[in-house]
């Protein structure tokens, strides 16, 4: 699987999950989140050659089409597969509230 | 929705479904499909700016991050959302067989 275990410990050139830290204030302009100040969101990057973790029958067809037509702009793209929530603390007035923000952290990628 | 109805009748620059015809023999090297000779597979293409048909909370965060960090390589990607099957005819010797190949045609796209 193109997950953090594999991708973070390899020098994989093809589609894989990459490390990305997002600072809520600096990178998103969000002032309402009190904790954490930022988080390891990660992102997906890398080419999707034929056979590389293809998501559907269509992805296989498109990757194969791309192999036969290397100049074509039609190609599968490396996108998130498994996403995890992020627990955050924000304030309503002086009262702290804990919330789970769903689908915030990329754990693995796929070619779609 | 970024579907064929909208995308094929517009000059949309952002993520949208685009027309692509695939010839089974020429583009994939498949000799075993008798009918059709090819099909309109379509593909997804175009940038994914903030708010543009974003798939998950993560996609929104990444698009916003990209807006704050325009030079970053981390950005959402335009990928298939709705896929449809394709009925095909292949031969087992002289005997024709009909099969549905699932997830073969792109009907709409999303930013993931």
């Amino acid at each position: 699987a193109l997950d953090t275990n594999y991708c973070f410990s390899s020098t994989e050139k093809n589609c894989c999950v990459r490390q990305l830290y997002i600072d809520f204030r600096k990178d998103l302009g969000w002032k309402w989140i009190h904790e954490p100040k930022g988080y390891h969101a990660n992102f997906c990057l890398g080419p999707c050659p034929y056979i590389w973790s293809l998501d559907t029958q269509y992805s296989k067809v498109l990757a194969l089409y791309n192999q036969h037509n290397p100049g074509a702009s039609a190609a599968p793209c490396c996108v998130p597969q498994a996403l995890e929530p992020l627990p955050i603390v924000y304030y309503v007035g002086r009262k702290p509230k804990v919330e789970q923000l769903s689908n915030m952290i990329v754990r693995s990628c796929k070619c779609s | 929705a970024l579907d064929t109805n909208y995308c094929f009748s517009s000059t949309e620059k952002n993520c949208c479904v685009r027309q692509l015809y695939i010839d089974f023999r020429k583009d994939l090297g498949w000799k075993w499909i008798h009918e059709p000779k090819g099909y309109h597979a379509n593909f997804c293409l175009g940038p994914c700016p903030y708010i543009w048909s974003l798939d998950t909370q993560y996609s929104k965060v990444l698009a916003l991050y990209n807006q704050h960090n325009p030079g970053a390589s981390a950005a959402p990607c335009c990928v298939p959302q709705a896929l449809e099957p394709l009925p095909i005819v292949y031969y087992v010797g002289r005997k024709p067989k009909v099969e549905q190949l699932s997830n073969m045609i792109v009907r709409s796209c999303k930013c993931s």
Epitope: K60, L64 | W30, K31, Y90, Y91, V92, G93, R94
Partner: antibody, heavy 120, light 108 residues
């Protein structure tokens, strides 16, 4: 160049199953159809079935239906043939072969063969 | 299923001679659903002819195939020492694919 490399010889007990692998290299596996053929010692050739790896459509000889399963793993360009409820008459060399492109077709490239011996 | 009968069972000839191998089908195969293979001891079969008369890549032109319907022939115009082997015909018109029982071509 095109190569089909099969797994090693197997000795099996009657009633058990065997799974033989066939790894393709040197060409686009995705455009292929793979057939499996066996040859009992000193005997002729017998077709068991075939698979279209990219869509996992398999076709079997009637006499093996229910006992043979042919599958493909595209990520490793490998095809598998599993034969269950083995009996002594299944002792044979098992070959994988790529066809000229159709489900039933002539077979242009062959694996080296895998000897399966069924004995108690 | 389609039964293929090869004749003769064994053919004894000398290098330089012409070999004619026959394959008869129990039902018509049309004109393009027959192949011929050569097999040597301990080796996998090697495709010689497909579509009844088309030579496979790399096969010398001394090998030729002919026939249609139920009667097919493999001809080796001038036998070379490496041609002595077992030859099989195969039909792929109908499932299951079937093979003939083989013709052994031996040195006289």
């Amino acid at each position: 160049q095109v190569q089909l490399v099969q797994s090693g010889a197997e000795v099996k007990k009657p009633g058990s199953s065997v799974k033989v692998s066939c790894k393709a290299s040197g060409y686009t596996f995705s455009s292929d159809v793979i057939s499996w053929v066996r040859q009992a010692p000193g005997q002729g050739l017998e077709w068991m079935g075939g698979v279209i790896p990219i869509v996992d459509i398999a076709n079997y000889a009637q006499r093996f239906k229910g006992r043979v399963t042919i599958t493909a793993d595209e990520s490793t360009s490998t095809t598998y043939m599993e034969l269950s409820s083995l009996r002594s008459e299944d002792t044979a060399v098992y070959y994988c072969a790529s066809t000229l492109g159709l489900v039933l077709d002539a077979m242009d490239y062959w694996g080296q063969g895998t000897l399966v011996t069924v004995s108690s | 299923e389609t039964v293929l009968t090869q004749s003769p069972g064994t053919l004894s000839l000398s290098p330089g001679e012409r070999a004619t191998l026959s394959c008869r089908a129990s039902q018509s195969l049309g004109s393009s659903y027959l192949a011929w293979y050569q097999q040597k001891p301990g080796q996998a079969p090697r495709l010689l002819i497909y579509g009844a008369s088309s030579r496979a890549p790399g096969i010398p032109d001394r090998f030729s195939g002919s026939g249609s319907g139920t009667d097919f022939t493999l001809t080796i115009s001038r036998l070379e020492p490496e041609d002595f082997a077992v030859y099989y015909c195969q039909q792929y018109a109908d499932s299951p694919i079937t093979f003939g029982q083989g013709t052994r071509l031996e040195i006289k």
